[in-house]
Amino acid sequence: MSITGISPITEYLASLSTYNDQSITFALEDESYEIYVEDLKKDEKKDKVLLSYYESQHPSNESGDGVDGKMLMVTLSPTKDFWLHANNKEHSVELHKSEKPLPDQAFFVLHNMHSNSVSFESKTDPGVFIGVKDNHLALIKVDSSENLSTENILFKLSETHHHHHH
């Protein structure tokens, strides 16, 4: 699966929450970032993530919400120079400092699900999605397309505004 072009087709800032309205938050600790799943009050500031959308080519037998052999992939960056990465060996989702071009581990296939929710499938490990496990983000294996609606891999994006630079 290859990214068509090295520039995103669009970018925007959004806050990310789980299907049951817990917020995905990020905290700098000892020069590395931690990712949390938290219950925030209505007046507590939601963390923002820069979503960069890329169009990718993929073989017709692969999953995804593409048309004519094209699908959307995203990278997610909560702060400058840091991106969410899939650590398939540890089944974890981590924040790493990276330089462009980003490694494949930073790309996720975007699936638009019901009720304005989305899911993020690891580019490097098809069938494995970002999900919530024990109040943390983790990589979760989804066995079949019927299980794509399982709530712990569904996320909501609350768009704030379009954004073209960090």
């Epitope: 905290a27 600790e29 949390y36 938290e38 925030l40 009050k41 209505k42 007046d43 507590e44 500031k45």
Partner: antibody, heavy 121, light 107 residues
Framework: EVQLVDSGGDQVQPGRSLKLSCVAS????????MTWIRQVPGKGLEWIAS????????YYPDSVKGRFTISRDNAKDTLYLQMNSLRSEDTATYYC??????????????WGQGTLVTVSS | DIQLTQSPSTLPASLGERVTISCRTS??????LCWYQQKPDGTVKRLIY???TLESGVPSRFSGSGSGTDYSLSISSLESQDFAMYYC?????????FGGGTKLELK
């Protein structure tokens, strides 16, 4: 479920010291400021100490400044209040409360059950 | 320091009655006000924050309103578990300060 459990209250003589503890669970402790509030028997509530989420900054009213020290151990999800040079007017129930997240939102969403400190000879 | 004046200090009321507690601040606090309930056993619970936002799990019979220096907490139809002490708190300016409290008691 968010829980704050206060402990360490006791009867002590004027001039002595006492250390209170508050163990937190059910939320990410290190992401929140924390506060101690007290209530003199039959009276109202008084804010007495706050600490930022990292523990780098602390705040006190004049009534306890220089005598009380708030601290926290984020590895143990525990808040402390070291009380020195205790006076009879420090007799109160002491509550720990979850304060704001970093510096956003509103304070004291959750409170401990309180621990009674009695200062008397 | 910002002073908060709660009134009345004691409020006798009957089950099913609608009651309102007032909190007046010595200077404008830009809606940075919370309301707390303290039960006789000492348990404290936040009911409302940002003047009018109801805490999740708090019954809809509670409501808050106000602006500038005048704020209020209303209970539309009193139930037995509502008889308690109520405190307002301003968090616009350090030191954050509480009102003196209102004791809601059964008439």
């Amino acid at each position: 479920e968010v829980q704050l459990v206060d402990s360490g209250g006791d009867q002590v003589q004027p001039g002595r010291s006492l250390k209170l503890s508050c163990v937190a669970s059910g939320f990410i402790f290190k992401n929140y400021w924390m506060t101690w509030i007290r209530q003199v028997p039959g009276k109202g509530l008084e804010w007495i100490a706050s600490i930022t989420n990292s523990g780098g900054n602390t705040y006190y009213p004049d009534s306890v400044k220089g005598r009380f020290t708030i601290s926290r151990d984020n590895a143990k999800d525990t808040l402390y209040l070291q009380m020195n040079s205790l006076r009879s007017e420090d007799t109160a129930t002491y509550y720990c409360a979850r304060d704001r997240r970093y510096n956003s939102g509103s304070p004291f969403a959750y409170w401990g059950q309180g621990t009674l400190v009695t200062v008397s000879s | 320091d910002i002073q908060l004046t709660q009134s009345p200090s004691t409020l006798p009321a009957s089950l099913g009655e609608r009651v309102t507690i007032s909190c007046r601040t010595s200077q404008s606090i830009n809606n940075n006000l919370c309301w707390y309930q303290q039960k006789p056993d000492g348990t404290v619970k936040r009911l409302i924050y940002s003047t009018s936002t109801l805490e999740s799990g708090v019954p809809s019979r509670f409501s808050g309103s106000g602006s500038g220096t005048d704020y209020s907490l209303s209970i539309s139809s009193l139930e037995s578990q509502d008889f308690a002490m109520y405190y307002c708190l301003q968090y616009a300016t350090y030191p954050w300060t509480f009102g003196g409290g209102t004791k809601l008691e059964l008439k």
